[in-house]
């Protein structure tokens, strides 16, 4: 029996900016039941505080609610693992809530088949940034992604939209069923989850181009 | 213990092309951004980029897009920069450094020195 | 690109003494959600940098009290209270509330 190894934080998200959870990895448990606790300060205090809910987030996580959830300030948190033989700390922690966000997908999807008569057909696809994201205050800048593929196919192609909200694609297989899907990411958070497919039939008249896909 | 360990010292011609590595330990790789900085013999620190090794996301400094190719392997939690098209301005020791979840530099390898000479 | 001009360019001090570094940037370093991204990093003879002072004037894990840091804006100073021999070194201020980040030319500090 031995005291619990060291553990590690290794994963912070947040939604939007509003609430964060992180989440340890336990070290070995030294062969007894242990108990762990996060403490935390922010930038400019001394005064640590114990993580307000380690229910939300799961099994071995701290969710910081609206009311302990600040961008302003920089937080500093540890681990502490405890059993009958001792305690053991993780690192220290720095968290700015600005680069840990993982917004939800995005919305309303939708893609159109278009065919002027003056030009070659394409695939047009728009979407909306997820409402828990307030795009308006300008520091929060959303990249997007976009991927497609035949019902049937197995391999995924993927084109970077980059801020745009809707994007052309001019190189389909003619009669096929594609799914499209898009996601997003800030520019230094992380990927969010892909948005439900949208399925779309191309005509089996749809002309192939020789370019790829371009940017609206 | 969280430890950024850098390929050794390269030696190169003009025109060529040089891959520096950097090894992390002590911790979980894909956590954290790794961030490329050089420095000139007797000049200052100069940012070249980062990279999410996560998922491959990465940011350059403009001056060095289209030279400097950031990548990582997962397997082996080691992220590496590739500058092509050497010149001998870029005689510099080559830092990877990591950050936490925030955008300054928390921890820093020990530099590979790059001398580009004829 | 944010260019970052460091005063002095070098600085010998008694040890004992206190020692200033002036950090100027050429645009505002207040970041679009309100947080200042200017940081001090010490290089001592021989060695990778080291982070001293995050966020304008916060201490990083294991960073005597000796050192501060001030400012906004565009104006910044770290401050040593009382000079160490260990202190030697080039000291750098960086932002990173702009793409590409950008360090100072650097203030090497010596001992009288």
């Known amino acids: 029996q031995l005291p619990p190894g060291k553990p590690e934080i290794f994963k912070c998200r947040s939604p939007n900016k509003e609430t964060f959870t992180c989440w340890w990895r336990p070290g070995t448990d030294g062969g007894l039941p242990t108990n762990y606790s996060l403490t935390y300060h922010r930038e400019g205090e001394t005064l640590m505080h114990e993580c307000p809910d380690y229910i939300t987030g799961g099994p071995n996580s701290c969710h910081f609610g609206k009311q302990y959830t600040s961008m302003w300030r920089t937080y500093v948190m540890m681990v502490n693992a405890t059993n009958q033989m001792g305690s053991s700390f993780s690192d220290e922690l720095y968290v700015d809530v600005t680069y840990i966000v993982q917004p939800d997908p995005p919305l309303e999807l939708t893609v159109e088949v278009k065919q002027p008569e003056d030009r070659k057909p394409y695939l047009w696809m728009k979407w909306s940034p997820p409402t828990l994201i307030d795009l308006k205050t300008g520091w929060f800048t959303l990249l997007y992604e976009i991927r497609l593929k035949p019902e049937k196919a197995a391999e995924w192609e993927t084109h970077f939209a980059g801020q745009q909200t809707e994007f052309k694609i001019l190189s389909l297989h003619p009669g096929q069923k594609y799914l499209v899907q898009v996601r997003c990411k800030p520019d230094h958070g992380y990927w969010s989850a892909w948005s439900p497919a949208t399925f779309i039939q191309i005509p089996s008249d749809f002309i192939m181009n020789d370019h790829h896909h371009h940017h609206h | 213990e969280v430890q950024l360990v850098q390929s050794g010292a390269e030696v190169k011609k003009p025109g060529s092309s040089v891959k520096v590595s950097c090894k992390a330990s002590g911790y979980t790789f894909t956590s954290y951004w790794i961030h490329w900085v050089r420095q000139a013999p007797g000049q200052g620190l100069e940012w070249i980029g980062e990279?999410?090794?996560?998922?491959?996301?990465?940011n350059y400094n403009q001056k060095f897009k289209g030279r400097a190719t950031l990548t990582v392997d997962k397997s082996s939690s080691t992220a590496y920069m590739e500058l092509s098209s050497l010149r001998s301005e870029d005689t510099a020791v080559y830092y990877c450094?990591?950050?936490?979840?925030?955008?300054?530099?928390?921890?820093w390898g020990q530099g590979t020195l790059v001398t580009v000479s004829s | 690109d944010v260019v970052m001009t460091q005063t002095p360019l070098s600085l010998s001090v008694t040890p004992g003494q206190p020692a200033s570094i002036s950090c100027r940037s050429s645009?505002?370093?207040?970041?679009?959600?309100?947080?200042?991204?200017l940081h001090w990093y010490l290089q001592k003879p021989g060695q990778s940098p080291q982070l001293l002072i995050y966020?304008?004037?916060n201490r990083f894990s294991g960073v005597p009290d000796r050192f501060s840091g001030s400012g906004s804006g565009t104006d910044f100073t770290l401050k040593i209270s009382r000079v160490e021999a260990e202190d030697v070194g080039v000291y750098y201020c960086s932002q990173s509330t702009h793409v590409p980040f950008t360090f100072g030319g650097g203030t090497k500090v010596e001992i009288k």
């Open positions: 990279i999410d090794p996560s998922d491959s996301y990465t």
């Open positions: 450094a990591r950050s936490f979840f925030t955008n300054w530099f928390a921890y």
């Open positions: 645009q505002s370093l207040v970041h679009s959600n309100g947080n200042t991204y």
């Open positions: 966020k304008v004037s």
